[in-house]
């Protein structure tokens, strides 16, 4: 990996062992200033593999609300607006990092957690398996 | 929101004001035990709106490596395997949280940062705008 020279102004950390505890400032910096969220907001409806968004809430997690995509159909929407079962709508999944309160119900102590979320759906050619 | 009773065994936190600093254990807990990653790994190639994955590396960020999807075509792949420009391939984007080293180059001090990543692509019906 890349070795980074340590900044002499870094805060001290007592525990140098893994699992290591670090300090995190929760005042979120948003890098998404030049994006237009309106543009992609209706893709879930206009896609040939449309999806619904379901709210997943967990007060022990940060962020507490995550939206999960569920494909509306097994097939994909064709040019006539009908479901075509020769193709399949499948969820596009991504692993994301969240903070889990640990110990539970603590406002200032967390553990990093990796979760898999479905972000949207795409239309794919199914793989054919010949079974006995 | 939901009020959670505070666990009496929580670590003390000096600063009760925002921006608040919390302790985070970086020993990641992986919740994705019952998923089959093989199933979705080739969707980028089999989709009617295929995409390429580009590696984005930043040693000042945690995770340092993030994969960004870029749609291969403006149009979508039709049943004959040709690009159909009546439809459009568009990226599905998601806001994710990452940790940004702050001050820079510090191994144990971070700030939460929100970034927008393209996870994959989907095929949509373009909106027609009539302009003068």
């Amino acid at each position: 990996g890349i070795t980074i020279p340590r900044n002499p102004g870094c805060p001290n950390s007592e525990d140098k062992n893994f699992p290591r505890t670090v300090m995190v400032n929760l005042n979120i910096h948003n890098r998404n200033t030049n994006t237009n969220p309106k543009r992609s907001s209706d893709y879930y409806n206009r896609s040939t593999s449309p999806w619904n968004l379901h709210r997943n809430e967990d007060p022990e997690r940060y962020p507490s609300v995550i939206w999960e995509a569920k494909c509306r159909h097994l097939g994909c929407i064709n040019a006539d607006g009908n479901v075509d079962y020769h193709m399949n709508s499948v969820p596009i999944q991504q692993e994301i990092l969240v903070l889990r309160r640990e110990p539970p119900h603590c406002p200032n102590s967390f553990r990093l957690e990796k979760i898999l979320v479905s972000v949207g759906c795409t239309c794919v050619t199914p793989i054919v398996h010949h079974v006995a | 929101g939901i009020t959670i009773p505070r666990n009496p065994g929580c670590p003390n936190s000096e600063d009760k004001n925002f921006p608040r600093t919390v302790m985070v254990n970086l020993n990641i807990h992986n919740r994705n035990t019952n998923t089959n990653p093989k199933r979705s790994s080739d969707y980028y190639n089999r989709s009617t709106s295929p995409w390429n994955l580009h590696r984005n590396e930043d040693p000042e960020r945690y995770p340092s490596v993030i994969w960004e999807a870029k749609c291969r075509h403006l149009g979508c792949i039709n049943a004959d395997g040709n690009v159909d420009y009546h439809m459009n391939s568009v990226p599905i984007q998601q806001e994710i949280l990452v940790l940004r080293r702050e001050p820079p180059h510090c191994p144990n001090s971070f700030r939460l940062e929100k970034i927008l990543v393209s996870v994959g692509c989907t095929c949509v019906t373009p909106i027609v705008h009539h302009v003068a």
Epitope: L74, N88, V124, P126, H129 | S40, Y43
Partner: nanobody, 116 residues
Framework: QVQLVQSGGGLVQTGGSLRLSCSVS????????MGWYRQVPGRQRELVAM????????YYADSVKDRFTISRINANNTIHLQMNNLKPEDTAIYYC?????????MGQGTQVTVSS
């Protein structure tokens, strides 16, 4: 691992009827479907009929609408294809299929021959 067992088929006169059956076992998700494809040698595989595992939604190819009926017995994941008013052009190998999102599992196939 998905397993499919299909039965039925055979030789029938034009205008006659046949019933195909198929049962599936293994990993079945709520967003899946079962049905039949058919294939004539040298021609492309055709989706004949399909039924959604949980919703019960059905799909029929235009060529078989009002003649074929697909039904499902939920308890043991068995489907039936009732084929009435059969025509010579229905002659083909019929494959039972189980469709999970992104994956299509096909059975061993059964011959249906309609003689004129």
């Amino acid at each position: 691992q998905v397993q499919l067992v299909q039965s039925g088929g055979g030789l029938v006169q034009t205008g006659g009827s046949l019933r195909l059956s198929c049962s599936v076992s293994g990993d079945i998700s709520s967003q899946s479907a079962m049905g039949w494809y058919r294939q004539v040698p040298g021609r492309q595989r055709e989706l004949v009929a399909m039924i959604h595992t949980t919703k019960g939604d059905t799909y029929y190819a235009d060529s078989v609408k009002d003649r074929f009926t697909i039904s499902r017995i939920n308890a043991n994941n068995t489907i039936h294809l009732q084929m009435n008013n059969l025509k010579p052009e229905d002659t083909a190998i019929y494959y039972c299929t189980h469709n999970e999102p992104g994956d299509l599992y096909m059975g061993q196939g059964t011959q249906v021959t309609v003689s004129s």
